[in-house]
Each structure stands twice: as C-alpha cells, then as structure tokens.
Interface confidence: medium
C-alpha cells in the first residue's frame, strides 16, 4: 500500500498558486506524484509522475472554489487522493507592495506600487483584481515603539512637518476594506529628515 502525500497545502502569494506537500516515508523506493484539478466535473492532470513535492496552479481562474488533489505513486501502485479546496481571490496572500521614499526637508514623500500578479499582463497588479484595494502606511520615529497608521487615498502620500534631522521608518501593505483582509508589510524604509524649510521672518 502506497501512503498518501502529507501536509498538503496551497502556498499562494499574489495568485502564484503552488500546491505543496511532503513525501511520506516509503521503504520500497522513491515515490512520484500526480496532481490534478477539477474542471467541469472532470479531474485534469496538472503535474504527472513528478518527483517534485509541488505543482504550479497559477493558471487557475482567480474566482470560485477549485478542488485540487494529489496522490503518491510507486510502480503500478498508488495512494488515495488527498483533496483540498482553494479559492484564489479569497485565499491568496497579498504580498508586500513596493515603496519609493524621498526626503524633502522635513517631509517624507512616498509612492506605492501594488504587487504584480503572476502570469498576467506586465501592467496587471493586485489593484486590478480587488476594486477596494487601498494601502495601509505605518510609520514611526526610529528607536521608538509608538507607531502611527494612515490610509492614503491615492498611490502616494506625504508625511509633513516631521522633526528635522530625525530618522523615520515607514512600511506599507495592501488592505481590502470590503474583506477586512490585510497583506504583508513591506520591509521598513528608514530615512533621515533634514532641516525645516520655513524661513524665520
């Protein structure tokens, strides 16, 4: 009897959908695996007789529930199927956006770039899929614990009237208000403000 794949899960970030599993202990030799997806009531092969422990399902429709399954094989024997259900638009992890930060005197000027989507047009981003897409920006004075959050209305934001000659750190994530779904934070970017540009009269 061939044991089934273990710890079967979908690792999906920005709609790059990778079904992953672990090979079970099997004394007779090396196992291969076949992964399939349900399409119009019929299971279709996606990865056949692979020695890998993952299979790329990024071409699935972003909408609706998909049934995926994987089994282990050895010679003419095979394990039972292990099934999972996956809805990309609900289940994919929102990866960190890009961010450009520029210091202008006592202000930080930030521009945000929504994560690109795998297997789509060059210009296609997560904003194109989620119409409520917005950004959360979190910033703090370097070395302090108190953090502040803002929700920019656009793809850019300016933090004004900051303390001069002080290092501020900023990070951004995507957020979907209509789903209460938060993405991953970007790595913090820390920049030092310069002087206050106001000229004393």
């Amino acid at each position: 009897m061939v044991p089934p794949p273990e710890n079967v899960r979908m690792n999906s970030v920005n709609f790059k959908n990778i079904l992953q599993w672990e090979s079970p202990a099997f004394a007779k030799g090396n196992l291969t695996f076949t992964a399939q997806y349900l399409s119009y009531r019929i299971f279709q092969d996606k990865c056949m007789n692979t020695t890998l422990t993952e299979c790329d399902f990024s071409s699935l429709s972003k909408y609706g529930d998909h049934t995926l399954r994987v089994r282990a094989e050895f010679a003419d024997e095979h394990s039972d199927w292990v099934n999972i259900t996956f809805c990309p638009v609900d289940d994919t992890i929102i990866g960190p956006p890009g961010m450009q930060v520029e210091v202008l005197a006592d202000s930080l000027h930030m521009r945000f770039l929504a994560p690109k989507i795998e297997n789509e047009y060059e210009t296609w981003t997560m904003k194109n899929v989620y119409n409520s897409w917005t950004y959360n920006v979190q910033y703090w004075k370097n070395g302090t614990d108190e953090k502040f959050q803002i929700t920019p209305q656009y793809d850019f934001e300016v933090l004004r009237n900051l303390e001069p000659w002080t290092t501020y750190c900023v990070q951004v994530r995507g957020f979907l208000p209509d789903r209460n779904k938060a993405g991953e934070w970007s790595e913090p970017v820390c920049e030092q403000t310069t002087h206050d540009e106001t000229v004393p009269s």
Epitope: Q149, I150, P177
Partner: nanobody, 111 residues
C-alpha cells in the same frame, strides 16, 4: 494584540432601529480604521460599512442610506447605527479592523 468586542445586538421589529458598538482594546495605537461586516445563514461575510483614518466611509450596497458608521473621538470604539431595518438584515454582525475580527453579535429582524 488587539481585541475587538461587539455589543448591542438583539431582536428588533422590521422598520425599527438598533445601534451596535465595537470596542477595541490592546495595542490600539495603529488601529485607526475599522469596519462592520455581517454574515447571514448560508451566505458569505459581506461589508456593511467601513470608516477610514481620515473619516471617509464606505458602505455595502444593501445598506446604503439606512446604516451609518461613526466612531468616538478616542477612535477605540466604532458604532453602527441601523435604521429602517429589514428582514434581510438578519445576520451575525462582526467588527473588523486590519485583518482582526470580533466574535460577532446577532441581529434578528422580525416581522
């Protein structure tokens, strides 16, 4: 860790009003925007109303013009004023903030 606790649910007649509250506790310094969601039996969770940091609001289509989201000055409590309630407003109402959920409060609209 932030905790969200809803209150104010109950049974109300169609056409009536109800006001829900959601109190946030824990590390709320970054909790500037919060919203209300609901889940009716056999349906998926949907947006009711959301309030952003700057006071902007966003509402789900079924409740526009009837429900209003507001918050206190400390921003640690958010309210949902529900007017002209309909039978189809019956659901469990959840408070949500940046991926965190409250436990929900039941609202039942009777005829």
């Amino acid at each position: 860790q932030v905790q969200l606790v809803e209150s104010g649910g109950g049974v109300v007649q169609a056409g009536g009003s109800l006001r829900l509250s959601c109190a946030a506790s824990g590390s709320t310094s970054t909790l500037d925007h919060m919203g209300w969601y609901r889940q009716a039996p056999g349906k998926s969770r949907e947006l009711v109303g959301y309030m952003f940091t700057d006071g902007r609001t966003q509402y789900g289509e079924p409740v526009k013009g009837r429900f209003t989201v507001s918050r206190d000055n400390g921003r640690n409590t958010i309210f949902l004023q529900m007017n002209n309630l309909k039978l189809e407003d019956t659901a469990v109402y959840y408070c949500g903030a940046q991926g965190i959920w409250g436990q929900g409060t039941q609202v039942t609209v009777s005829s």
